[in-house]
């Protein structure tokens, strides 16, 4: 009896694991083995596929084969007993294109109201992702073990901290990787659960802000209790994106170690140009708080986020405001190559009742004004990155009178 070729060959590639699966074409024939050959692009000869010779099952692993993952290969399979079947040729494929990203490795650390998630690729030093290792982003699904209501968090890096959780509560999460450059979405990790700790008697400091005074940075924060000491630490922000880094070596700001006020002042030259993360911790001598939420601090934005300059065109029932780049000394405009959001405050000159408009655009309409009335306007710029949390000071107020009625066109 002629042996039939195996059918329906599937190639599964997850990270650096290459698995072949196929169907027996004739279940009634016993003691059949299967063998594969492969052929690289531009070659005529077929080579025996190591790891996939004389296989008795319908699955084999050819991960040990050192392939160029960007090069197309072809496979063929046959059945063998006393004689052999004809070869069944599998559609050619490029390993990289076919590969899926495996589940990442996840480590969790719990605080009372936060969880720190450390994520790394599931396959260390992967050949498949060797050129893309730095491009991985991750997304996760988190839920309270007791409720099961899921929250999704997209586009995170190898270390992520989730805040505003409840103490002594078990949270579960799963993480998957993505390579957006290659349109690849990975497989979820197993579910990891962790219980947040008992609530710390000392809350972390809040509302951290940095401003510039003379040649110094002034760091301020809020705290619930008096008679505390505080310390401030910094970290290069880019380290958060480094997938190989699992140890974050936060450094003390010398002038902000054991300070007894809710602010500290340190020279601008402590930091070279760059983006940093800052965090603050409180202590009463016996107990220590968890660290505050980390704020992003960009030395360039910090130094140069100036109030916007604007012109007003007055109509009878509205102002049209045109926002321009702020001016440096010497009247040259400052180029701010990061997205800003503008906060415009306006009020009737004879009243204290302020109204506010928040706009991304640089031309803004202030509606519903009364004719022949003097209104004053001031504006400030905010960075759109919530973690930078940086605002300019307000511009000087500009006051203008609206036109008489029926000039709104």
């Amino acid at each position: 009896k002629n042996l039939k070729s195996p059918q329906k060959v599937e190639v599964d590639i997850i990270d650096d694991n290459f698995i072949l699966r196929w169907n027996r074409s004739d279940e009634s024939v016993g003691n059949v083995t299967f063998s594969f050959d492969y052929q690289k692009t531009g070659m005529d000869n077929w080579i025996k596929l190591s790891g996939c010779q004389n296989i008795t099952s319908t699955k084999c692993n050819f991960s040990s084969l050192k392939l160029n993952v960007y090069e197309e290969i072809k496979l063929r399979i046959r059945a063998e007993k006393e004689n052999t079947s004809s070869w069944y040729e599998v559609d050619s494929f490029t390993p990289f294109r076919k590969a899926q990203i495996g589940p990442p490795e996840v480590h969790l650390e719990a605080e009372d109201k936060a969880i720190v998630i450390h994520i790394s690729p599931g396959t260390k030093d992967s050949v498949m992702w060797a050129l893309d290792g730095l491009s991985f982003t991750y997304s996760l699904v988190i839920w309270k073990n007791s409720s099961g209501v899921e929250e999704r968090i997209e586009n995170i890096y190898s270390r992520h901290k989730i805040y505003k959780l409840s103490p002594e509560t078990t949270y579960c999460l799963k993480v998957k990787a993505a390579l957006l450059t290659s349109w690849k979405i990975g497989v979820y990790s197993p579910v990891h659960c962790i219980k947040t700790t008992v609530e710390n008697e000392l809350p972390p400091p809040e509302n951290i802000e940095v401003s510039v005074q003379n040649q110094n940075y002034v760091l301020k924060w809020d705290y619930t209790y008096a008679n505390m000491t505080f310390q401030v630490q910094w970290l290069h922000a880019f380290l958060k994106r480094n997938p190989g880094n699992h140890l974050y070596k936060w450094k003390q700001i010398p002038d902000c170690e054991n300070v007894k006020t809710t602010q500290c002042v340190f020279p601008q030259n402590v930091f070279q140009k760059g983006i940093y993360l800052l965090r603050v911790q409180a202590s009463d001598g016996n107990n220590t708080s968890f660290w505050s939420e980390e704020i992003k601090f960009d030395t360039e934005i910090q130094a140069f986020l100036l109030p916007p300059v604007f012109n007003i065109r007055s109509l009878s029932d509205s102002f049209h405001i045109y926002i321009g780049a702020p001016k440096q000394s010497g009247n040259t405009p400052v180029i701010q190559d990061y997205p800003l959001i503008y906060e415009i405050i306006f009020w009737e000159n004879t009243s204290n009742a302020e109204r506010k408009i928040i706009e991304k655009k640089t031309d803004v309409t202030v509606p519903n004004l009364k004719p022949l009335t003097v209104y004053c306007v001031k504006a400030r710029a905010h960075t759109m990155d919530e973690k930078l949390n940086k605002s300019s000071v307000f511009s000087d107020a500009v006051c203008e009178k609206t036109k008489p009625g029926n000039t709104s066109k």
Epitope: E109, H118, T197, L247, Y248, T288
Partner: antibody
Amino acid sequence: EAQLQQSGAELVKPGASVKLSCTASGFNIRDSYIHWVNQRTEQGLEWIGRIDPEDGETKYAPKFQGKATMTADTSSNTAYLQLSSLTSEDTAVYYCASWLADYSAMDNWGQGTSVTVSS
Amino acid sequence: DIQMTQSSSSFSVSLGDRVTITCKASEDIYNRLAWYQQKPGNAPRLLISGATSLETGVPSRFSGSGSGKDYTLSITSLQTEDVATYYCQQYWNTLYTFGGGTKLEMK
């Protein structure tokens, strides 16, 4: 595989100094903290301090301030512990250990260096 | 400094026993606790970090639990190779401190 190799046993006289070494393989000490721990005969473990090899920043247990000095040379992937003004109380095994991840602890240990202070 | 107390300095044990070793901190250490195993003549070996996370390669008969100031290392069914001294260590405070150790000895 991450490993730490420590220098050989030392027999030193009271009042003298000694410098112990700890060489890493399988990882870069710049990416870790290196801790030093000692253990006197039949006693428990005692933390001496830690160094960040990347910038030389150190932290010492109060008891070892002035007694121990930690340094590191990233070019040779080696950390050092210098002990000064030695007395018989300093006779112990000294271990180096690496700390490679926030979520872990002292995950790799050297085999230990025995220091005997005797006249 | 945070003091770490291991109440029993030694334990007599038999093969197959369930063993529980306790460790108490002088203040809340919020699960920043590691357990190490040390056999005579050898360097310590990390078993558990974060109070409960088992290190890769550590047998599943070992487990860690606890919170606040009180922590426990459990061995479900003691094997010959588990006879050693066990140390806890806190890392909530950067002046790291070890417990005095608990030695397991065969009856």
